[in-house]
């Protein structure tokens, strides 16, 4: 008796596809060993057709795949475009050779069955309509025309030309003729359901001279498209329901026993479980729309259905499309915290993951908004200028090659609380959803800048100091000049003593920035921050106004000009490591979208994609003469 289990018999028809699931015992070895699908020959040898090691035989090329689901202890073999040649005996199994643990599967592929020649077959999907053509001889033109549905004993009237209609077809069936053609009548049945499937007879006239035609109406539930997605990645359900429902409300629901629970619809309904990680996007006037879900969880796996109806709810007899979503827990997307906490006036540094193989992809950050169908306007990007309302407090730091970019938001208010997405225009799986929670501050911030009302005088020397607690001693301190293209880190010079010290004097821990001499271009926002390598920590911001010696005018107009600044670190050395990294965001990654999708993610995505420097690399400021870098003590 084999511990592997699956279907002993699989039968299908030519042109169709099969999805064969094989179950294996729950052991670590089984989860990681090779999985295979082989065909048994007359000699008893089993020839591999596909395996989890990446092998794919020539006869399966382009039409088969094998996916392992270690968390379910199953693997699935999908085979498409079946032919009668695929009929045979197979094994699904585990092991380095095809003589390991296995299970016998018999696959039979038959021809599409043929009906008697006088039967016309109509194959339609649920919710669609059918127009049945019923030809007749001229002598039956004045006679009654009818369509009836065959039951066991009789043929039950559907509709006739005297306007009799079966109650279950009222409002759905129409009998009509086209133009002056007196040799054919038509019956249209709309909003087809499973119950409409069967054999029909259309008839013109009575008795032996009557014209009759047999009709076989097949009403198909759409076969679910199989979607295999990684944990924490994203999925897009592309729903194409046709022009006839273009003006109806659209929905996506999830099958739950005998109901389909609506997850989102275009009337504003949304399941709270998907808050912050779902968008519904009407595509065009042809009834096409898409639903994007990010940050996939194990419990998101299931049977999904999209449809259209004025109620925004599933209704029998309306067109649908279905998917079976599998969520694979062996994910390439790193596990990160999905909730980031900050305090009013403070800052958060959010580490956004992206596919390390796509370091040159454009990075974005958008804020998910749930109103209407949900949208995610881009706030900042590597080539997208910061939105005006985030001036001076938002920047994106790209760290090419390490699979992470950082978004820093400071001067937090409770209004900043909500859901944000990390996006790239590359690998569509790497979209991350982060929930930002902002609590009222109950203590002084870790970083404080003095003076707080900073007005520098043109041509003079101006110094601002950033005070930090001892716990930040071993971290790198920096000042950067903010512009709407990023925050360019200013060249710094450590003036603090480097000898070991046992104590840490809280009052003397500071990093200073000196502008000497002050120029008009120096006006703008400056940030003081801490970081450890490429991991960014807290920041605080200050606006420095520049006024002329004689009159006190200062207008807010931050520019991208390089501050002629000298950053000095004045600190005592403490023998300690970082014990705390407050507000450091480690988000829960999700997937991402392609270039086309990114345009749908947010209203501003398109216009924000202006060119400009990424504003990311350390020490980006242009070189300046030494007179701008006098030491400050």
């Amino acid at each position: 008796k084999s511990p592997i289990f699956g279907p002993q018999e699989v039968s299908s028809i030519e042109g169709d596809s099969v999805s064969i699931t094989c179950y294996y015992p729950d052991t670590s070895v089984n989860r990681h060993t090779r999985k295979y699908w082989c065909r048994q020959g007359a000699s008893g040898m089993c020839t591999t057709l596909i395996s989890s090691n990446g092998y794919l035989s020539k006869e399966y090329s382009g039409r088969a795949n094998l996916i392992n689901f270690p968390e379910n202890n199953t693997f699935v073999i999908n085979i498409e475009q079946l032919t009668q040649d695929d009929t045979g005996s197979y094994k699904c199994g585990l092991g380095t050779s095809n003589r390991g643990l296995s299970f016998d599967v018999s696959l039979e592929v038959s021809q599409v069955p043929e009906l008697p020649s006088d039967t016309h077959v109509y194959t339609k999907d649920i919710g669609r309509n059918v127009t049945i053509e019923c030809p007749f001889k001229r002598e039956n033109a004045p006679s009654k025309k009818s369509l009836c549905k065959k039951t066991n004993q009789s043929c039950e009237l559907v509709i006739d030309s005297t306007e009799k209609v079966n109650p279950s077809y009222i409002g759905r069936a129409k009998l009509f003729m086209k133009g002056t053609d007196l040799t054919v009548f038509y019956v249209n049945i709309s909003h087809l359901t499973h119950n409409d499937a069967g054999l029909y007879i259309c008839q013109a006239g009575e008795g032996p001279s009557a014209d009759k035609k047999n009709v076989d109406l097949q009403v198909l539930a759409p076969e679910p498209e199989l979607l295999y997605k990684d944990l924490r990645s994203s999925v897009t359900f592309e729903c194409d329901l046709g022009r006839e429902v273009a003006n109806e409300a659209k929905y996506l629901c999830r099958m739950n026993k005998e109901t389909c629970d609506v997850i989102i619809n275009t009337l504003g309904k949304r399941d709270p479980d998907f808050e912050g990680r779902i968008l519904i996007t009407p595509k065009d006037d042809n009834g096409r729309f898409s639903v994007l879900i990010t940050g996939l969880r194990k419990e998101d796996a299931g049977h999904y259905q999209c449809g259209a109806h004025s109620s925004g709810l599933p209704q029998e007899g309306w067109p649908i499309q279905t998917w079976q979503l599998f969520v694979n827990e062996e994910s390439t997307i790193p596990n990160r915290r999905s909730v980031v906490k900050g305090v009013t006036g403070g800052s958060v540094a959010i580490a956004c993951p992206y596919n390390p193989k796509e370091s040159s992809s454009l990075k974005y950050w958008c804020r998910w908004e749930g109103d209407g169908n949900g949208h995610c306007p881009v706030l900042v990007g590597t080539q997208a200028q910061v939105q005006e309302e985030y001036e001076g407090r938002l920047a994106l730091f790209d760290q090419p090659g390490n699979g992470t970019y950082t978004v820093i938001l400071n001067q937090l208010t409770t209004e900043d609380a909500g859901f944000y997405w990390c996006l790239t225009n590359g690998d569509s799986r790497w979209r991350t959803t982060i929930e930002l929670q902002v609590a009222e501050a109950t203590r002084e911030p870790n970083l404080e800048v003095t003076p707080q009302n900073a007005t520098a005088v043109l041509g003079e020397t101006f110094t601002v100091s950033c005070h930090y607690p001892c716990k930040f001693y071993s971290q790198e301190k920096y000042w950067c000049k903010w512009s709407n293209k990023g925050c360019h880190i200013l060249p710094s010079h450590d003036e603090g003593a480097r000898q070991s010290s046992v104590s840490c004097d809280q009052s003397s821990q500071l990093v200073s920035m000196t502008l000497n001499p002050v120029s008009k271009e120096d006006e703008g926002w400056y940030w003081c921050g801490v970081k450890q390598g490429q991991t960014y920590g807290e920041t605080t911001a200050i606006y420095i106004a520049v006024e002329e010696r004689t009159r006190g005018s200062s207008h807010v107009n931050p520019t991208d000009a390089n501050a002629r600044a000298k950053v000095a670190l004045e600190e005592e050395v403490v023998d300690s490591s970082i014990s705390e990294k407050e507000n450091k965001a480690i988000p829960n990654p999700g997937p991402f979208a392609n270039e086309r999708e990114i345009q749908n993610v947010g209203d501003q995505a398109q216009e924000n994609r202006a060119s400009g420097d990424a504003g990311s690399a350390d020490g980006q400021s242009r070189s300046s003469s030494s007179k701008h870098h006098h030491h400050h003590h």
């Epitope: 279907p7 002993q8 699989v10 299908s12 179950y23 539930a221 679910p224 005998e258």
Partner: nanobody
């Protein structure tokens, strides 16, 4: 609400045959799994066989103990499933339950079926 009604149970001699039928009423489905389970006196309920419809394909599953003797068949347009039991043995004596799952996915041997019939008794005498 879906109702499952089993029929065809009874007393049969060892080596004989019996055909069980199960009809589902209340809703039409085109993609689902229907299975047969059995429970012998004093024992736990166990999987016997299942049939799964998905798209144009049909998948049949059997427990090792009935392989080659029992055959499952069904008509998903009529929502019926039949179990042809040949070469019956005394150890096949049990109450046979029909079960239906509205999704065609998941291990057919598991208990995660949405609906269960009342059961029909099969007694195999030696």
């Amino acid at each position: 609400q879906v109702q499952l009604v089993e029929s065809g149970g009874g007393l049969v001699q060892a080596g004989g045959s019996l055909r069980l039928s199960c009809a589902a009423s209340g809703r039409a489905f085109s993609q689902y799994t229907m299975g047969w389970f059995r429970q012998a006196p004093g024992k736990e309920r166990e999987f016997v066989t299942a049939i799964r419809w998905s798209g144009g394909s049909i998948y049949k599953y059997y427990a090792d103990s009935v392989k080659g003797r029992f055959t499952i068949s069904g008509d998903n347009a009529r929502n019926t499933v039949d179990l042809q039991m040949n070469s019956l043995k005394p150890e096949d004596t049990a109450v046979y339950y029909c079960a239906a799952r509205m999704s065609p996915w998941g291990d057919p041997r598991g208990n995660e079926y949405d609906y269960w019939g009342q059961g029909t008794l099969v007694t195999v005498s030696s």
